[in-house]
């Protein structure tokens, strides 16, 4: 029995965090063979679809409105009991998003975190949110919740994540809520990918034609390893964005990616990491840093890569 002796277990798929207009499946797990259940909401807000209705297996609720936010329970059918129904299930909180302007989400010291270390995810907004919620993509459990601290017209909350293990890597979003409607959340923050590094053998990084080049000369950085990495990630010190390329198997049995940097103008320090398609947020140890110097020009900053590079999307599969 998932829910205990006479207690069903209520769950939500894909998540308890549902966008306005979206759908959520509420499933009441009870005794095998007893699939009928009743659903009810623990507040006065009127969700008419539930009144006196009996559901089978699961109930798809939606399109959801702010009125659907709140705490739900179910009772399983128990034909031979006095009432005909089981004891109430566990409470399940459904949160509806898109009710206020989105907050911002930042990682301190940064989104690349060594295995075993901690990262602070700071959610903040100039909307005076009372609570902040942090949710990891693909997780059906309730999001973490913290009370917002208000200072200088900004409300913020610091979520401490770690010690970091592969299971904690992934795409995070945060939300805010106001006191009288704690389960009517804001629009989601922009997604933030938290990457765990240091799990596999480091790749090697080299420069063609070499680490010291003339201004205007084309430079390519090659990342390679004997490990069969699917993707390589190239990061430059002082830049928030990384570049990534699919690894190509070479005749010498190494796996390599060549990053064309274009005509050299300024130098910089580069590192590369390898990862596997199945775990896109879990990266290898960093390659040794490679300092690229450009002669005939001051070594300040390399121009932004020509192709767009996004803050998020690391943790999605590269097709």
């Amino acid at each position: 029995l998932m829910g205990g002796q006479d207690k069903p277990f209520l769950s939500a798929r894909p998540s308890t965090v549902v966008p306005r207009g979206g759908h959520v499946a509420l499933q009441c797990h009870y005794r095998r063979g007893f699939n009928n259940f009743m659903l009810y909401k623990e507040d006065r807000s009127h969700v008419p679809i539930f009144h006196g209705r009996i559901f089978q297996e699961s109930f798809i609720m939606g399109p959801v409105t702010p009125a659907h936010a709140g705490t739900y329970r179910c009772r399983g059918s128990r034909p031979h009991s006095l009432t005909g129904w089981s004891a109430p299930s566990n409470p399940l909180v459904i949160m509806v998003t898109g009710n206020h302007r989105k907050p911002s989400l930042l990682a301190h010291p940064g989104p690349l975190v060594k295995s075993g270390e901690r990262v602070i995810l700071q959610c903040w907004s100039d909307v005076m949110f009372e609570h902040f919620f942090l949710h990891r993509e693909g997780i059906s459990e309730d999001p973490s919740r913290l009370v917002g601290q208000i200072h200088d017209g900004v409300s913020k909350a610091n979520f401490s994540i770690g010690p970091l293990m592969p299971v904690l890597a992934g795409t995070y979003r945060c939300y805010g809520s106001v006191p009288h409607s704690p389960y009517q959340l804001s629009a989601p923050s922009d997604p933030l990918d938290i990457v765990i590094t240091g799990l596999y053998e480091k790749p090697s990084l080299s420069a063609q034609p070499g680490p010291t080049v003339q201004a205007g000369e084309n430079v390519t950085l090659s990342c390679s390893s004997w490990s069969s990495y699917d993707i390589y990630h190239l990061s430059r010190e002082g830049e928030a964005h990384e570049r990534r390329l699919r690894a190509v198997p070479k005749v010498n049995r190494t796996f390599q990616a060549d990053f064309p940097l274009g005509p050299a103008t300024h130098g910089g320090t580069y590192r590369c990491f390898g990862s596997f398609r199945a775990l896109p947020c879990v990266w290898s140890n960093s390659s040794d840093p490679l300092l690229v110097s450009v002669t005939g020009n001051p070594s300040s900053s390399w121009p932004s890569p020509t192709e767009p590079s996004s803050k998020s999307g690391i943790c999605r599969h590269l097709h």
């Epitope: 702010p66 302007r101 100039d126 909307v127 106001v178 009288h180 409607s181």
Partner: antibody
């Protein structure tokens, strides 16, 4: 600085309609819900409801369902309170106030309903 | 609805005196309580939010305390400009509800 400026006093006959405006400045209008509060002569404050300035959804207290309507003109950072089919008991000063804890208030609009 | 009971309904106090106004909620409202000052012909002024947080620009002689069901507003040393009507408000649950008000006058 944050300011809520309401429209001027209104003298109406029973059965008529009044629309009060509340123009916000000094902050991002869609960041804070707008509340409406009634103060009848010699009486206390009564919360009428609020409108979510991000989604446009109004919520009314039970005593203000039916004849009362909250609306927005987001491009002008303005919230409105409309009262239809005015009754004598609607004579009051109406305030707009923004945010979850009613941080800033308008100066109030006196609506007098009289024959 | 949550009922907010404010006391006293009116009071006289001397300049420099310490004044306390109380507000009792009919159920637990956490710390979601604000205090306001009303003066004739002026916009209401928000003094305190979240039970004990002073709004920017409000003199430090005003303070709020309490949580759950029992709350108070204290003026540590009464000044002439403090006379007016004071209201509490719970914003834990819809509909928001105000206390009945306390009229504060100078002796």
């Amino acid at each position: 600085q944050i300011q809520l400026v309401q429209s001027g006093p209104e003298l109406k006959n029973p059965g008529e309609t009044v629309k009060i405006s509340c123009k916000a400045s000094g902050y991002i209008f869609t960041n804070y819900g707008m509340n409406w509060v009634k103060q009848a002569p010699g009486k206390g404050l009564k919360w009428m409801g609020w409108i979510n300035t991000y989604t446009g959804e109004p919520t009314y207290a039970d005593d203000f369902k039916g004849r009362f309507a909250f609306s927005l003109e987001t491009s002008a950072s303005t919230a409105y309170l409309q009262i239809n089919n005015l009754k004598n008991e609607d004579t009051a000063t109406y305030f707009c106030a923004h945010g979850p804890w009613l941080a800033y208030w308008g100066q109030g609009t006196l609506v007098t309903v009289s024959t | 609805d949550i009922k907010m009971t404010q006391s006293p309904s009116s009071m006289y106090a001397s300049l420099g005196e310490r004044v306390t106004i109380t507000c009792k909620a009919s159920q637990d409202i956490n710390s979601y309580l604000s205090w306001f000052q009303l003066k004739p012909g002026k916009s209401p002024k928000t003094l305190i939010y979240r039970a004990n947080r002073l709004v920017d620009g409000v003199p430090s002689r005003f303070s709020g305390s309490g949580s759950g069901q029992d709350f108070s507003l204290t003026i540590s040393s009464l000044e002439c400009e403090d006379m007016g009507i004071y209201y509490c408000l719970q914003y834990d649950e819809l509909p928001y509800t105000f206390g009945g008000g306390t009229t504060l006058e100078i002796k």
